[in-house]
Amino acid sequence: GIAIPRNSGCPNSEDKNFPRTVMVNLNIHNRNTSTNPKRSSDYYNRSTSPWNLHRNEDPERYPSVIWEAKCRHLGCVKADGNVDYHMNSVPIQQEILVLRREPRHCPNSFRLEKILVSVGCTCVTPIVHHVA
Amino acid sequence: GIAIPRNSGCPNSEDKNFPRTVMVNLNIHNRNTSTNPKRSSDYYNRSTSPWNLHRNEDPERYPSVIWEAKCRHLGCVKADGNVDYHMNSVPIQQEILVLRREPRHCPNSFRLEKILVSVGCTCVTPIVHHVA
């Protein structure tokens, strides 16, 4: 669960009164003020480990739409445009929090859920190359 | 806010009775069952655009600890270990949901917040601006 700051008057997480269900305000506060508006915009295409973005939609989840990256090549793209198979494209994955409607279709009751998403791809040296 | 499935008996999001505050169960369900256990483990070090991971801690947020990637180089690392400045290491960023205690220190009241995090780095061809 969530670690609660130790304030007097706050039951600790071992306490039977510790809240397993909390109130959450859905008016999302967006902290991304000073970020580069371009962000990862066209990196998916310009990367040496380019990726495609696939739309994953689930109306029982918030956010309902998540974009999943899928690397385009097993190798990495060289300056001449050919694939270098001595290098490997791999997905960079991150665990994110989503809200899952529980019970299903219920508008005001959710459960926190962790899911693993691929955000983009990076080019790595393979662990092993040749056999003696 | 969150788009609600149109079920009979569910007020729509224009309705004044639409819930802006919902109940969320904090017993996290983890969906990462069939994912590759290796995940991004040592990619940060083996990448041609390697990155360091910085711990960002905030007790008023859940998750309280978020790891931020910072690219190690402006350029990308070549096979010989030298940096190629004709290429650029760039962070792959993703918007994620977190829960922010509101009011502060309150254990059972939160607000959804979107924050932008850098998950890792990728090597891209630079956008070249030629001078006429």
């Epitope: 495609n52 899928k70 690397c71 385009r72 090549h73 097993l74 190798g75 445009g81 198979y85 001595h86 490997n88 494209s89 791999v90 997905p91 790595v124 393979p126 662990i127 092993v128 190359h129 040749h130 056999v131 | 590759n36 256990p37 290796k38 990619y43 083996r46």
Partner: antibody, heavy 120, light 111 residues
Framework: QVQLQQPGAELVMPGASVRLSCKAS????????IHWVKQRPGQGLEWIGE????????NYSPKFKGKATLTVDKSSSTAYMQLTGLTSEDSAVYFC?????????????WGQGTTLTVSS | DVVMTQTPLSLPVSLGDQVSISCRSS???????????LHWYLQKPGQSPKLLIY???NRFSGVPDRFSGSGSGTDFTLKISRVEADDLGVYFC????????FGGGTKLEIK
């Protein structure tokens, strides 16, 4: 069902060029790579190259760079391979095949092949 | 290029036999994403290759369960538990983690 249709045979003169076709049906053309593979009589299979129909990205085996050029026509879901400077060494059966991307990167469906004969 | 070596070149069998075909690669076929890209095809005379097994051990749709694949690193095996007449032809292994290459083929024929 997934089908890759290729003409049965082509006869061309030495030194000439030829364009082989591969018409895809039964799936979304732009979601899969198209590969080309050469097979000489009684011999093994040689990979020539691949093209991504979604953006026409091509990747060639070093051996066939300069010999083969891969293109697609999205409107007709057809892939093409142009072979130039033909010699008797180019006489072979040429297969097109499709593959998925990344985790699904293997040729799962193949055309019946075009027999190319280079002869005067 | 990665060299794929198949043994034997020719495999005379009787119907109902269990047979194994070996494929060895000159380089390890494990990708950094954890997958091993070694596949098996069957080519019958006058036809195109048909996918049997992908990524070492996964049977392609419609392939009977008498076909199985195993192995890791550089050594791989295709097993047919009970050979049927429809199984005769040339078997190829291939790898797609490097520039794609194919083995030389193993001809399965009746004794």
């Amino acid at each position: 069902q997934v089908q890759l249709q290729q003409p049965g045979a082509e006869l061309v003169m030495p030194g000439a060029s030829v364009r082989l076709s591969c018409k895809a049906s039964g799936y979304t053309f732009t979601n899969y790579w198209i590969h080309w593979v050469k097979q000489r009589p009684g011999q093994g299979l040689e990979w020539i190259g691949e093209i991504d129909p979604s953006d026409t990205f091509t990747n060639y085996s070093p051996k066939f760079k300069g010999k083969a050029t891969l293109t697609v026509d999205k409107s007709s879901s057809t892939a093409y391979m142009q072979l130039t400077g033909l010699t008797s060494e180019d006489s072979a059966v040429y297969f097109c095949a499709r593959s998925g991307i990344y985790y699904d990167y293997y040729e799962d469906y193949w055309g019946q092949g075009t027999t190319l004969t280079v002869s005067s | 290029d990665v060299v794929m070596t198949q043994t034997p070149l020719s495999l005379p069998v009787s119907l109902g036999d269990q047979v194994s075909i070996s494929c060895r690669s000159s380089q390890i076929l494990l990708h950094s994403n954890g997958n091993t890209y070694l596949h098996w095809y069957l080519q019958k005379p006058g036809q195109s290759p048909k996918l049997l097994i992908y990524k070492v051990s996964n049977r392609f749709s419609g392939v009977p369960d008498r076909f199985s694949g195993s192995g890791s690193g550089t050594d791989f095996t295709l097993k047919i538990s009970r050979v049927e007449a429809d199984d005769l032809g040339v078997y190829f292994c291939s790898q797609s983690v490097h520039v794609p290459t194919f083995g030389g083929g193993t001809k399965l024929e009746i004794k």
